[in-house]
Amino acid sequence: LPRWRQQWSGSGTTSRFPETVLARCVKYTEVHPEMRHVDCQSVWDAFKGAFISKYPCNITEEDYQPLVKLGTQTVPCNKTLLWSRIKDLAHQFTQVQRDMFTLEDTLLGYLADDLTWCGEFNTFEINYQSCPDWRKDCSNNPVSVFWKTVSRRFAETACGVVHVMLNGSRSKIFDKNSTFGSVEVHNLQPEKVQALEAWVIHGGREDSRDLCQDPTIKELESIISKRNIRFFCKNIYRPEKFLQCVKNPEDSSCLSGI
């Protein structure tokens, strides 16, 4: 008889989830020499251990600690790029600017990017039918807790000048409820981080406003300054050429680094 399974509001675990995580791990460790020592089977076991046979609305950051330990990775100072509500552009940026890292350019972020997963209490099965939705079901679900955990760690280990890419087309350019606003901002370490520089990406072709004067950016500046970290903000006008360079990084004018 088919066992009764709780119906959640979110989509179920991504198909072929174990194989995907393992394959991504192997690929990442092959491409990044500094992570060659990582045993991908152990990584998968630690990942699995964080959520398998656990009630998917009761996951804690503690559950992910073995995985975090195995995936420890050092991002060089001045090379951390945070983002909020502008993921694709941030990732396109680091695809060209190879020496800079978003969370998803690190091993743990790369493993989980765009994936969904959850298990169920008291069974070793993965739930491919449905998983808890952050809003409709619970916030302490496997995916949300994972990103909160690794985002916290990513921010804690950042050093030097940290950059953040923000979406100037959003009504809240800085959103206190985003992962950046609720986790990363509060876990930058003042003794290691000299400054946070925000890049506000303009969407409109003729939007000449100074979006660094936006009230939400002023709020970000206030939070950062109170933590004794210097804050800078730049309007990124005319991003079209930047986007062209993303498509054609061999263009001679795209090769000059930051």
Epitope: S208, D210, Y237
Partner: antibody, heavy 122, light 107 residues
Framework: QVQLVESGGGLVQPGGSLRLSCAAS????????MHWVRQAPGKGLEWVSN????????FYADSVKGRFTISRDNSKNTLYLQMNSLRAEDTAVYYC???????????????WGQGTLVTVSS | DIELTQPPSVSVAPGQTARISCSGD??????VSWYQQKPGQAPVVVIY???NRPSGIPERFSGSNSGNTATLTISGTQAEDEADYYC?????????FGGGTKLTVLG
Amino acid sequence: QVQLVESGGGLVQPGGSLRLSCAASGFTFSSYGMHWVRQAPGKGLEWVSNIYSDGSNTFYADSVKGRFTISRDNSKNTLYLQMNSLRAEDTAVYYCARNMYRWPFHYFFDYWGQGTLVTVSS
Amino acid sequence: DIELTQPPSVSVAPGQTARISCSGDNIGNKYVSWYQQKPGQAPVVVIYGDNNRPSGIPERFSGSNSGNTATLTISGTQAEDEADYYCSSYDSSYFVFGGGTKLTVLG
């Protein structure tokens, strides 16, 4: 090597028209935005107008909006500035300049022509 | 629109440091470039993106930009640095230049 050569300047009466040209060579003209910048005798630089590499967007300083039109012919490697309803205060050396982009977010003028003098006087 | 204000003139002894300011409302939120113009010549970019030096520009030229002021610094100023200097910035629709500063190298 990159070369920008302006032509078409001269003496014109107030209210008159003039068309400036800028012949570009030594680079792929169709890949670069272009600008006109002017400098009145003994005065500072004033940005006039900008056109995207493919001609899709044009921008003007408030002082010339509605009177000047920037255009380009990528097949001829030439930039133009059509100047109508000219005034005495438009008297200046007019430079064309190449819009340089540097990864990730920087724009500036990296090559300039030697300029052509436009004198508006009765 | 952006408005950029520069001092009309700055004097410096050879070998000393010259600083040319460019002030504008929250100019630190935008990128600034600097141009050198010698008499009868077209301008030449010496700094772009606040503090980047194009190839061929001597290391003595540097830039900074925060708050309401961008600054061009010339360390160990030489006689050949005597020229007019213009700051410039841009937004989505406009480019703009400061009024220019005449740098005089004394002696």
